[in-house]
């Protein structure tokens, strides 16, 4: 019962004698596994016996067995799904059909396999794309109807006889669908491919030819074209006469039309083969070459280039770059079309031939002002010389040299002048246009480049101008040597270095900043009095009473200047102490008395101490000794001592008398 | 509009000297080189001398060479010719010419008669 | 030595065309030239430039019934629909610097005479 058995399998393989065949297969029997397996050669079914007839090919029973002549043929499947089979080698008389008797527990089935042995190998099949056009790409295929895991093949490809140099891609199948060895070959035909034989050749492993298959290529192409031009250099001189053929040495399909072209542009009425130019211009120069169309499209040939040589024509100057600025590059180039290109070139510069110079180009490096001017040239090949033309002037800009400022006044200049300057220079390109002063002032310009200083400062030292036009030059500053009275007067105390002590030696020193001129002569003076003429003022031993006001004074020539009043400080112990008391030295008791410490002191008594008759101290050290109420008991002689941060005085005795008052005595 | 207005002609005796003038309008005129041409009663023209727009360059007919020179001025706008030991045959019409492109001698002055006789 | 030659006289009826010639030696063949016309007792006023390709470019209030053209060493100046005020002597020019030395060369001249 067919439905029972599901097959899958080529329904035809090929092989040819000696060589193997491999026939994968799949089967399903849908009521459980295979029991029995008999491979005949053309079976045929006997109705009278029920049994099929023909050659056992190979058979597999329940117990296993196989006949050992059968080892040629070799069932490589299972009980229950693979049935492929193996035949190595095969015969021709291998041919037929196969049938593939098998039967499990309770049903049986034949399938045929058809197979076809030839005497030799048969030869493979090439497949060409249905049109071949140069340089497109195509996929040339070879196909052969065999593979069989025991008889390697290859496939080669040759082209007129000779392998290809492409990499062919080798694919193999061997499955239930189908089985075969296919080549592809990838390859870009040229138009010389035309009519050339493609073989694919079948070889055994060992490269051994076995059999092939041939085809002629047929490479549709554009015309393919051949130029020639008399005279065979395409060089002529201006007045002759050039001839120019095309000839066509291949073309699929026919050629149609016949143009031709100059530097890629069609030339108008020429559609002959042969193109005749008469006595030939300059601008007759370029590239010639014949185009012919077919179906494909158009071909040209390779390009000849005319060459119509001529002297050379006018020259001119090409400046990079004019104006110039001085230390730039500067580059001259002789502009003058020639054929042949121009051997030699002479320069001139403002009408003087530039020795050495024989080049296109004149590179100068560093331009200098004296590069400027007209520059001219001359181009020569084997034709002649050209016309010379009037040139191309290089403008060289530069800064303003040589620049300086100038005092006009008269000399020596005093603090308080007028000063009149100029600024002067020697060349310029650009013009100057303005100028520039350090250091910068409130100052007059009256006009351009002079520069009017009023009421010059006794610092006004030196001063700088700039010429400028599109860059500033600066001249070296000019001293003006203004010349003032001393200045910054002052008085410095030069020892002791601390505080003036009473007793100390003492310096004063009468210093000043500057002077112009230099010679100068001192004064001192305290409180409009004379004290000396020297820059130092000397005390030996300081008194107090030196202390004051002090101002020293400078002159030269011009002028003369006083310092500061500066006060001298003289510092002492507190001196002339003595007690005064309040209301008096007498005091009825039970009224107030006050005590004061009087003194000189500089600085002043910070601390007070007082003392009774006995030379005890007092708790009391204020400067004020307040005795409210005063008792007689405090009768007697006072002192005190004052101390200052320079040292200690003390007061000779006071003394304070307390009497009785009017009651005390009443009571007694 | 450009104008070249030539002064200074006259007559003067061999080996005198003159100085001519040219004055140049409507044009910048220190862009161009300028030229004196002469012209002899009934005779072609002739080239005298040529010079630069910056007066780096100056060339002069062989025929006045030493004798003449040509000078400008550019912030004067104006062109000269210094004339020495002049002979009877610089007798001539003087023109003064502005030259442009390669050779054009594009604009020409009224031109001043110059007459060299004893 | 650069040298321009010129045909001295030349005649033609008034409206009709005219074109004058100037040849350069041969060794010139590719000069520039220039053309002027030169009126009795007035200064030569410049017409035109003509280059060794046949371009020209004419000076300042030239009318364009003047034009110029080239073949090899000859130069043309042609006028078209002449007219009375074109009479007068045309004369080529040409300019070069030989060496340290510049020289301006001038052709004969052509008197143009204009008939009717």
């Known amino acids: 019962d067919s439905s029972k058995w599901v097959f899958e399998h080529p329904e035809t393989l090929y092989a040819w004698e000696g060589a193997c065949v491999w026939i994968p297969c799949t089967y399903r029997a849908l009521d459980g596994d295979l029991e029995s397996f008999i491979l005949f050669h053309n079976p045929e079914y006997n109705k009278n016996t029920s049994k099929f007839d023909g050659t056992r090919l190979y058979e597999s029973t329940k117990d296993g067995k196989v006949p050992s002549e059968q080892k040629r043929v070799q069932f490589l499947g299972d009980k229950n799904k693979n049935c492929t089979l193996s035949i190595h080698p095969v015969h021709l008389n291998d041919s037929g059909q196969l049938g593939l008797r098998m039967e499990s527990k309770t049903e049986k089935w034949m399938e045929r396999i058809h197979l076809n042995v030839s005497e030799r190998p048969f030869p493979p099949h090439i497949q060409l794309p249905p049109e071949i056009q140069e340089s497109q790409e195509v996929t040339l295929t070879c196909l052969l109807n065999f593979s069989c895991y025991g008889y390697p093949i290859q496939l080669q490809w040759l082209l007129e006889g000779v392998p290809m140099r492409q990499a062919a891609v080798t694919s193999t199948s061997l499955t239930i669908k189908s089985v075969f060895t296919r080549s592809e070959l990838k390859f870009s035909p040229q138009w010389s491919h035309h009519g050339k034989i493609v073989t694919c050749q079948l070889q055994d492993a060992d490269g051994k030819f076995l059999s092939n298959d041939t085809v002629q290529l047929n490479v549709k192409h554009t015309p393919k074209l051949e130029i020639k031009v008399t005279p065979s250099d395409a060089i002529v001189r201006e007045g002759d006469s050039v001839t120019m053929t095309c000839e066509v040495s291949s073309s699929n399909p026919e050629y149609t039309t016949v143009s031709w072209l100059k530097d890629g542009t069609s030339l108008k009425k020429q559609n002959t083969f042969t193109l005749n130019l008469r006595e030939v211009t300059k601008d007759q120069s370029g590239k010639y070459c014949c185009q012919v169309s077919n179906d494909v499209g158009p071909g040209r040939s390779e390009e000849v280039f005319l060459q119509v040589q001529y002297a050379p024509e006018p020259s001119t100057v090409q400046i990079l770059h004019s104006p110039a600025v001085e230390g730039s590059q500067v580059e001259f180039l002789c502009m003058s079309l020639a054929n042949p290109l121009p051997t030699n070139y002479t320069w001139y510069h403002n009408g003087k031939e530039m020795q050495g110079r024989t080049e296109e180009k004149v590179h100068i490096p560093k331009i200098l002002p004296w590069h400027a001017g007209t520059y001219s040239c001359v181009a020569e090949n084997i034709l002649g010389t050209g016309q010379r033309g009037p040139g191309a002037e290089l403008d060289v800009q530069y800064p303003p040299k040589k620049v300086t400022t100038v005092i006009q006044n008269p000399m020596p200049i005093r603090e308080g002048d007028t000063v009149t300057l100029s600024c002067n220079y020697n060349s310029s390109n650009p013009s100057v246009t303005r100028y520039e002063w350090k250091p910068h002032g409130a100052w007059e310009e009256p006009s351009l480049g002079v520069l009017k200083i009023q009421n010059v400062g006794w610092d006004n030292t030196t001063i700088a101008c700039a010429a400028c036009n599109s860059w500033c030059s600066w001249a070296s500053p000019v001293a003006l040597n203004v010349q003032y009275a001393p200045r910054d007067v002052r008085v410095r105390k030069i020892k002791p270095l601390s505080e003036i002590h009473s007793g100390n030696s003492v310096s004063l020193q009468c210093d000043f900043s500057s002077s112009h001129p230099k010679e100068v002569q001192f004064f001192w003076e305290k409180n409009g009095r004379l004290l000396g003429k020297e820059s130092q003022l000397n005390f030996d031993s300081i008194s107090p009473e030196d202390a004051g006001s002090y101002s020293c004074w400078v002159n030269n020539s011009i002028g003369q200047t006083a310092s500061k009043a500066w006060t001298l400080e003289v510092l002492y112990a507190p001196r002339r102490l003595r007690v005064s008391m309040s209301p008096g030295d007498q005091v009825m008791e039970g009224k107030s008395a006050t005590l004061t410490c009087e003194s000189d002191a500089n600085p002043p008594v910070s601390h007070y101490t007082w003392f009774d008759w006995n030379n005890q101290s007092l708790p009391y050290h204020s400067q004020k000794l307040r005795l409210e109420p005063v008792k007689v008991q405090h009768s007697g002689a006072y002192w005190c001592q004052g101390t200052n941060s320079v040292g200690k005085g003390r007061s000779p005795l006071s003394t304070l008398t307390v009497y009785y008052s009017p009651e005390t005595i009443g009571r007694r | 509009e450009v104008q070249l207005v030539e002064s200074g002609g006259g007559f003067v005796k061999p080996g005198g000297s003159l100085k001519l003038s040219c004055a140049a309008s409507g044009f910048t005129f220190s862009d161009y080189g300028m030229n004196w041409f002469r012209q002899a009663p009934e005779k072609g023209l002739e080239w005298v001398a040529y010079i630069s727009r910056g007066s780096h360059t100056i060339y002069y007919a062989d025929t006045v060479k030493g004798r003449f020179t040509i000078s400008r001025d550019n912030a004067e706008n104006t062109l000269f010719l210094q004339m020495t030991s002049l002979r009877s045959n610089d007798t001539a019409m003087y023109y003064c010419v502005r030259m442009a492109g390669y050779y054009a001698m594009d604009y020409w002055g009224q031109g001043t008669s110059l007459t060299v006789s004893s | 030595q650069l040298v321009l030659t010129q045909s001295s006289s030349a005649s033609f009826s008034l409206g009709a065309s005219a074109k004058l010639t100037c040849t350069l030696s041969?060794?010139?063949?590719?000069?520039?030239i220039e053309w002027y016309q030169q009126q009795p007792l007035k200064p030569p006023k410049y017409v035109m430039e003509v280059k060794k390709d046949g371009s020209h470019s004419t000076g300042d209030g030239i009318p364009d019934r003047f034009s110029g053209s080239s073949s090899g060493a000859d130069r043309y100046l042609s006028i078209s629909n002449i007219q009375s005020e074109d009479e007068a002597i045309y004369i080529c020019?040409?300019?070069?610097?030989?060496?340290?030395?510049?020289?301006?060369?001038f052709g004969g001249g052509t008197k143009v005479t204009v008939l009717g």
């Open positions: 041969s060794q010139h063949s590719s000069y520039i």
């Open positions: 020019g040409v300019g070069d610097t030989i060496k340290e030395q510049f020289v301006y060369v």
